[in-house]
Amino acid sequence: KETAAAKFERQHMDSSTSAASSSNYCNQMMKSRNLTKDRCKPVNTFVHESLADVQAVCSQKNVACKNGQTNCYQSYSTMSITDCRETGSSKYPNCAYKTTQANKHIIVACEGNPYVPVHFDASV
């Protein structure tokens, strides 16, 4: 079974590129990361930083998560991210996404030993 940490990496990490490569980035990535397998995941964020830098966020600014839990952390510095948002014309199984590149602080929920990201909460 896929661990929560491994799922986070699959769904949100893309250290191989420093930014979205094209306007088709999200369409390709959402499919290749199995985020359109059973349905079109409406929104997803990919982070273009090293795994070590993203894991380090778990010792940075402690903030409340959107769901009220308190094991979320905000990155001290901005990170290169790509937001993928489903378009109005998107219809499963032909999922379609708008690709938006940004530099923002990320907020992740952390758990476990080692203490690592298990959920992408927001970007600010």
Partner: nanobody
């Protein structure tokens, strides 16, 4: 580097009291929740008590309710555990933890102290 340093452990007779203290250094912000966990020899680590930074949210394990009191310096990364009416079964290493959730699940806490030993003799 964040460090949590506990103090106040020791040997006490059953029915006695101890006060544990924990302070976090090297962290520029305020942890929302800080708490105490304990681990007795051969047993799993268990949650004892936790409290939020405003002092409004507290949680206790059933085994310590009415005997232990957790407190914090408001808005600061310090936490205390007043332990009264101690029992031999309270004997354990007590760990301070920070940055976790309010459910007293150790998986949600990211920062840990080295632990302080509490021994309750009968």
């Amino acid at each position: 580097q964040v460090q949590l340093v506990e103090s106040g452990g020791g040997l006490v007779q059953a029915g006695g009291s101890l006060r544990l203290s924990c302070a976090a250094s090297g962290y520029a912000y305020t942890y929302i929740y800080m708490g105490w966990f304990r681990q007795a020899p051969g047993k799993e680590r268990e949650g004892v008590a936790a409290m939020d930074s405003g002092g409004g949210g507290t949680l206790y394990a059933d085994s310590v309710k009415g005997r232990f009191t957790i407190s914090r310096d408001k808005g600061k990364n310090t936490v205390y555990l007043q332990m009264d009416s101690l029992k031999p079964e309270d004997t354990a290493t007590y760990y301070c933890a920070a940055g976790g959730g309010y459910e007293l699940r150790d998986r949600t806490y990211g920062q840990w102290g080295q632990g302080t030993q509490v021994t309750v003799s009968s």
